[in-house]
Amino acid sequence: TQNKALPENVKYGIVLDAGSSHTSLYIYKWPAEKENDTGVVHQVEECRVKGPGISKFVQKVNEIGIYLTDCMERAREVIPRSQHQETPVYLGATAGMRLLRMESEELADRVLDVVERSLSNYPFDFQGARIITGQEEGAYGWITINYLLGKFSQKTRWFSIVPYETNNQETFGALDLGGASTQVTFVPQNQTIESPDNALQFRLYGKDYNVYTHSFLCYGKDQALWQKLAKDIQVASNEILRDPCFHPGYKKVVNVSDLYKTPCTKRFEMTLPFQQFEIQGIGNYQQCHQSILELFNTSYCPYSQCAFNGIFLPPLQGDFGAFSAFYFVMKFLNLTSEKVSQEKVTEMMKKFCAQPWEEIKTSYAGVKEKYLSEYCFSGTYILSLLLQGYHFTADSWEHIHFIGKIQGSDAGWTLGYMLNLTNMIPAEQPLSTPLSHSTYV
């Protein structure tokens, strides 16, 4: 029989990304003898858990175990049995759980407790489930894309291994869009980070990085839509909301109780003379854009410059990888090409939003209506966030690279999270004398 005394020469790690709208399980693999080399870890599997995000299980925690079963069983199939007990499993929950914790710490703890108990029942090396901070989410996303792009490698290459590579060691900024939050992370050019909360210092592979990061809670695409609806229904004359962010002919009934369920809409909450209202799409990009801009408070800035809501943002610097929902939405809209200018993107969004709902449904028959109906809003929101929120311009737009995968690994925070927790990003060059693990990220 196979004995533990003869470990395999590869290792595996599992990270579950418990997002606001869904949970995904990622399996990573790397050669055991090259743990400290940059770029050796790669993703071998992604399993999307069927169902909503874990925060939605607050009233049915007993269902969490079943919810996680299929993807955990998939992990047992993919990873060799002899490796199961040595394979670390981490679960990181993001903004959906941050919002639940804001409402009730007790309920958030209960959900996490059941998640932990469910995951510890598997024959892996379960290392815990926790709500990661927005700052961590931004930082780990930045680490992931730069690790995969080979930016931490000191060996200069004459060839390019990925389409976005510029053959220099200048790191990429990271733009991450989720359902409940969005993160912006990059190394500013010789600029002091005026707000300490937004400053991170890393020493990776012998080089120091001063990184800016911020996570905007409630500004993920789903929560931004709830915010917009809550804002717009305030001024509606009756229970019909004529909404420019939905296609002409689209209709949907919304419960007011659902609208005010999230902490993100608290600032717009008011007593309405109805329990439900109907969204009626009118499909107008420009009006949708204007409505979205009202979510960004740009009138107040206690720093030399801000993004919105009084949050410091240094001048943008270098290239950016835009991933997660930035990529998924733009990919659906066929707008991820490097050749498509910002003006062209805007033009195409205008045309897309103006298309009648019946026509859209016919054109995209295989897409779930719930998702299909929101692409006009999401695309418009992405443009508004990047241009007015983060101050990208028509010129700097070409520095945004919409990235789904880099060399087969998904862009996102999970790989960076695992690299850090497994101590696979050394502070110094691996060839130099190893330092204690206290110097890791």
Partner: antibody, heavy 121, light 107 residues
């Protein structure tokens, strides 16, 4: 030689407590998940519970029938596994085996000789 | 929890004959099924792991097969020392469970 030796069994009244020990030798105890399995007189085998490693924060799992009453612990420095049994019931009467798997997991290729626990008034 | 049902409860065979013991799981457990032999006054002994994997030191006449919910332990030619009780065990998920056992007795 790989060996597991249980001790601590005996006669105890219902509601009473008992602590079983299992001394391990011949293998690196701290590297392996350890289990307790019991067998009632003339009956089949029943898994009692497991304890994992220090790296797993010594995580434990139990059969529903003993949950809240039995506690498994280990002392890696002494190569010893323990089973603390509280609120004992007559149906806990059994031979208790200390077991482990030196290959892979969740099957038992090493067994102790067993120690008998009798719960009776 | 996964329930394992063994059949028959008692199997009578003569030495030299073939013995076929069955174990059925209440839900699919892939190949996570293990077989043990127990003789009176002794601790159980692992015979087969992961449905069909043989253990060094166990005679080749013992073999296992099956996957999903139906599993079989076969003794190709029963020897006198094989008369004992045989248990199957779910090694797929917690709680770990055992079948009720099949007693192999001399005919």
């Amino acid at each position: 030689e790989v060996q597991l030796v249980e001790s601590g069994g005996g006669l105890v009244k219902p509601g009473g407590s008992l602590r079983l020990s299992c001394a391990a030798s011949g293998f690196t105890f701290s590297k392996y998940w350890m289990n307790w399995v019991r067998q009632s007189p003339g009956k089949g085998l029943e898994w009692v519970g497991e304890i994992r490693l220090k790296s797993n924060k010594y995580g434990t799992h139990y059969a529903e029938s003993v949950k809240g009453r039995f506690t498994i612990s280990r002392d890696d420095s002494k190569n010893t596994l323990y089973l603390q049994m509280n609120s004992l019931k007559t149906e806990d009467t059994a031979v208790y085996y200390c077991t482990t798997q030196l290959d892979l997991y969740w099957f038992f290729d090493v067994w102790g000789q067993g120690t008998t626990v009798t719960v009776s008034s | 929890e996964i329930v394992l049902t063994q059949s028959p409860a008692t199997l009578s065979v003569s030495p030299g004959e073939r013995a076929t013991l069955s174990c059925r799981a209440s839900q699919s457990i892939s190949d996570y099924l293990h077989w043990y032999q127990q003789k009176p006054g002794q601790s159980p002994r692992l015979l087969i792991y992961y449905a069909s994997q043989s253990i060094s030191g166990i005679p080749a006449r013992f073999s296992g097969s099956g996957s999903g919910t139906d599993f079989t332990l076969t003794i190709s030619s029963v020897e006198p020392e094989d008369f004992a009780v045989y248990f199957c065990q779910n090694g797929h998920s917690l709680p770990l469970t055992f079948g009720g056992g099949t007693k192999l007795e001399i005919k």
